[in-house]
């Protein structure tokens, strides 16, 4: 089943997020992803946990998953590089770099997103955009078109409270509010964008969605700049 969903959001403006990727398994949407270089998509390591025998591909330039669109193209994956410290039972280091079989054809609907390299927390209250093709309600309805939602960043101390994530939020993670509007499992690997810059990647740990006491958890890309650079080099 797809890992993730946008709850309480709305349909995104078509192709206004040209960095947005759909990581697909055997032709079906599995996770979100973000184009960070011409031949590289960043996603979440847990997305490929159950994909050992399947064919992993990356869809770029899409708004609708099913309808033909001139900018849409499906790329094979040459190499999948999960973060070496990612583990199935933790949310830490939940990053994955996917090398496309060839450089993406860039255009208005396909464009890499600048990512944050300065290792400094986003200020609490900052509104950030998260997008994905995950299910849109608790009944499990899957959207065909890209959805998005604006979420305020939550301070780490609040996120670390016992009734929230009880100390699990390290300096390499960040949180966003989850009061009815939220990202969740299937949006995993998708981008959290603040001020036009990629700040976080949706983690793919199991988590109740849309409950304000269980904020969304995002991997801070700035904290992994050295690793990303080393893989892309």
């Amino acid at each position: 089943p797809p890992r993730g969903r946008i709850l309480g959001g709305r349909e995104a403006e078509a192709h206004a997020r040209p960095y947005m990727a759909s990581v697909q398994l055997n032709g079906a949407h599995l996770c979100g992803g973000v184009l960070v270089a011409e031949q590289w998509v960043l996603s979440a390591a847990h997305c490929l946990e159950d994909a050992a025998d399947g064919k992993v591909q990356v869809l770029l330039g899409a708004h609708s998953l099913s309808q033909p669109e001139p900018s849409k193209r499906l790329y094979d994956v040459l190499r999948a590089v999960p973060h070496p410290d990612s583990q199935p039972d933790t949310i830490d280091h939940d990053l994955l770099l996917l090398q496309l079989s060839e450089k993406a054809t860039l255009g208005p609907a396909v464009r890499p997103l600048p990512w944050q390299r300065v290792d400094r927390d986003v200020a609490p209250g900052t509104l950030c955009d998260v997008a994905g093709w995950g299910i849109v309600n608790h009944a499990g309805r899957r959207p065909d078109s890209l959805q998005h939602v604006l979420l305020p960043v939550l301070d780490r101390a609040t996120c670390n409270r016992r009734t929230h994530h009880d100390g699990a939020i390290t300096e390499r993670l960040m949180c966003a509010e989850s009061n009815r509007r939220d990202s969740c499992k299937g949006d995993s690997g998708g981008p959290l964008v603040c001020g036009g810059v990629l700040e976080g990647v949706v983690t793919s740990g199991s988590r109740v969605c849309g409950n304000r006491k269980k904020p969304g958890i995002y991997t801070r890309v700035a904290s992994y700049a050295a690793w990303i650079d080393s893989v892309l080099a």
């Epitope: 670390n160 016992r162 009734t163 100390g167 300096e171």
Partner: antibody, heavy 116, light 112 residues
Framework: EVQLQQSGPELVKPGASVKISCKAS????????KNWMRQRHGESLEWIGD????????SYNQKFRGKATLTVDKSSSTAFMELRSLTSEDSAVYYC?????????WGQGTLVTVSA | DVLMTQTPLSLPVSLGDQASISCRSN???????????LEWYLQKPGQSPNLLIY???NRFSGVPDRFSGSGSGTDFTLRISRVEAEDLGVYYC?????????FGGGTKLEIK
């Protein structure tokens, strides 16, 4: 290693105030709430209140409103609790504890004795 | 406030014995998020409390597996399968689901 170092014992007169401190080390101070507890001699623990070190937001046990005031100094990674209008009933050991995970990390306690 | 009642007040045991401590709340301590924030702490003489169990049954890192927690709703139990000398002290249950958080009155585990 996470450590919470509390200030030393205090002997204070009835009606006076006292400010005790809890200096954090081994982690980023602003990443976790600080909670305060009271333990009278031979008794159980009582939760006084908590503070978010990012913005100073506080929550108090109704029982301690007007008695305790919680503050932080981010520059020195220190949390403070001021107790005012002290009486013999306030004689106790006061603990700070980091919240997350649970109350896994506690200060060593500060003994406050109120005596004429 | 949620009242946490522990029994017994004192528990004399022989080393190697099993020990059980009960903790009852006067209302459910299931949080609105669905979790139950029931914890157990051990306070040895002259020391600060130490976290043993969180969310009813989860052992904190480094806590020996002879400690186990169980229960739901309003009725909770801490079990020590084989008491060792280092386990002696006062055990407190704690609920963090409702404000203000509250501790039980304590159970003193001592040598028979």
């Amino acid at each position: 290693e996470v450590q919470l170092q509390q200030s030393g014992p205090e002997l204070v007169k009835p009606g006076a105030s006292v400010k005790i401190s809890c200096k954090a080390s081994g982690y980023t101070f602003t990443d976790y709430y600080k909670n305060w507890m009271r333990q009278r001699h031979g008794e159980s623990l009582e939760w006084i209140g908590d503070i978010n070190p990012n913005n100073g937001d506080t929550s108090y046990n109704q029982k301690f409103r007007g008695k305790a005031t919680l503050t932080v100094d981010k520059s020195s990674s220190t949390a403070f609790m001021e107790l005012r209008s002290l009486t013999s009933e306030d004689s106790a050991v006061y603990y700070c504890a980091r919240e997350g995970p649970s109350f896994a990390y506690w200060g060593q306690g500060t003994l406050v004795t109120v005596s004429a | 406030d949620v009242l946490m009642t522990q029994t017994p007040l004192s528990l004399p045991v022989s080393l190697g014995d099993q020990a059980s401590i009960s903790c009852r709340s006067n209302q459910t301590i299931v949080h609105s998020n669905g979790d139950t924030y029931l914890e157990w702490y051990l306070q040895k003489p002259g020391q600060s409390p130490n976290l043993l169990i969180y969310k009813v049954s989860n052992r904190f890192s480094g806590v020996p597996d002879r400690f186990s927690g169980s229960g739901s709703g309003t009725d909770f139990t801490l079990r020590i399968s084989r008491v060792e000398a280092e386990d002696l002290g006062v055990y407190y249950c704690f609920q963090g689901s409702h404000v203000p958080p509250t501790f039980g009155g304590g159970t003193k585990l001592e040598i028979k």
